[in-house]
Amino acid sequence: RTTTCFGDGCQNTASRCKNGGTWDGLKCQCPNLYYGELCEEVVSSIDIGPPETISAQMELTVTVTSVKFTEELKNHSSQEFQEFKQTFTEQMNIVYSGIPEYVGVNITKLRLGSVVVEHDVLLRTKYTPEYKTVLDNATEVVKEKITKVTTQQIMINDICSDMMCFNTTGTQVQNITVTQYDPEEDCRKMAKEYGDYFVVEYRDQKPYCISPCEPGFSVSKNCNLGKCQMSLSGPQCLCVTTETHWYSGETCNQGTQKSLVYGHHHHHH
């Protein structure tokens, strides 16, 4: 394989890409978890950027009494269905207007019984670590509001004075589904065999998947003048040697002056 790499041992570089790296003719293209000339280094930070928003879906049933059921309502492309959908959506937009997480409603099925409306209430919130609580609270408010409106907007003498009237006993919440986002789980998965050493830390409410080799976080390992390197046995400090000192110790914090060592040796000899 010809390459545009120059220098000694260059022709072997292609076959030396490590950790699943692939040679592109110029350099090793590394998979997400690795970097370096030969993909030999493990990254210290993995992007697990959360979705901008998290959604929830509530499956509800309400019974509308101010519209009489006709067969055409079963057909979602009929004019009847479209008009019903328009009125129902407007009514629900009013009902849920005070809920910031409310996005809209989606009718899944209309069936006989006055008009039994099977529908989804769609909720959405910006991602924060507290998104579950936010959406849980929103679903509770949805339940309160739909229960209230279906109790208050009722037919009197077969006549409705509101945009829509309901059967008080026909309101049911079938199911609530929240989009699951678990940064810790994502972090562990993406870190693969290094999963035990990567953790999630938050900054400005955003999760960061980091190893102790990533500086600036509470779990960061201080290698002083050394370099933090990840291995399968965990993060380790690779200590440096300067012109004047050798550094050693778990965090490279023990410096030994070379002159003292050399002096000792000369004395010894």
Partner: nanobody, 123 residues
């Protein structure tokens, strides 16, 4: 596209009569619900008389016994016969329609509207 065009409005003396018509085009006239609403100056739009394809009819208490709603499916036309007119009947009268079989007086539930015809009852 549904179109409703009212006619028959005008000036009439108290105790007089008028017949409003609403010519419809754009969907099957025999389906759904039809109605007459009115709006007096400075007041909200209110239901006067409603009729549905299943035979249900409604009249506002203030017009019961004086107004009659009817329709002619062959002509796709809705009518409002107004007798014994009073000064308080003065308003713009609107024809409304929906393909749904409605039981509601609330104008927000009605999807199709005419442009309105003025009825003035004055001596």
């Amino acid at each position: 596209e549904v179109q409703l065009v009212e006619s028959g409005g005008g000036v009439v003396q108290p105790g007089g009569s008028l017949r409003l018509s609403c010519a419809a085009s754009g969907f099957t006239f025999s389906r759904g619900s039809w109605g007459w609403f009115r709006q007096a100056p400075g007041k909200e739009r209110e239901a006067v008389a409603l009729i549905s394809s299943d035979g249900w009819t409604f009249y506002a208490d203030s017009v019961k016994g004086r107004f009659t709603i009817s329709r002619d499916n062959s002509k796709n036309t809705l009518y409002l016969q107004m007798n014994s007119l009073r000064a308080e009947d003065t308003a713009v009268y609107y024809c409304a329609a929906s393909v749904l079989v409605l039981r509601t007086l609330n104008p927000k539930a009605w999807h199709h509207w005419g442009q309105g015809t003025m009825v003035t009852v004055s001596s």
